[in-house]
């Protein structure tokens, strides 16, 4: 019997990114974001 399998062809990876607040403003501390599929979403 033939076996059929659906495959979207790609995986979406996510990664935590951390930035320093002073690089993007004047505050102290770190900002944590999430990159999904190459796009920072949070």
């Amino acid at each position: 019997d033939a076996e059929f399998r659906h495959d979207s062809g790609y995986e979406v990876h996510h990664q935590k990114l951390v930035f320093f607040a002073e690089d993007v403003g004047s505050n102290k501390g770190a900002i944590i974001g999430l990159m999904v599929g190459g796009v920072v979403i949070a």
Partner: nanobody, 124 residues
Framework: AVQLVDSGGGLVQAGGSLRLSCAVS????????MGWFRQAPGKEREFVGA????????YYADSVKGRFTISRDGAKNTVYLQMNSLKDEDTAVYYC?????????????????WGQGTQVTVSS
Amino acid sequence: AVQLVDSGGGLVQAGGSLRLSCAVSGGTFSSIGMGWFRQAPGKEREFVGAISRSGDSTYYADSVKGRFTISRDGAKNTVYLQMNSLKDEDTAVYYCAGRPAGTAINIRRSYNYWGQGTQVTVSS
């Protein structure tokens, strides 16, 4: 061109302390975000921690939080990694690295300047 020179590695007993230094030359020190990475044999190079350009903010990997401290001395153009309560699993080659402002601090590809690395061996 910006150059980073690591030093201070060595052999230390578990539970001991070591301070690594990274001297920065050839660039404007205050414009470079600095971080430390490490690479154990057979493993990927991993993020250890970073310090902001002003030195006001630091961020650490969970594995070293509370044990390692990063500081920077603008007068000497040097960044330090103070390592306390060292464990066997801290054995690795340690690299300091520099990145442009505005880039993510915890990923390797943000960093375009690298030191040559200094070996830290923790023995039990």
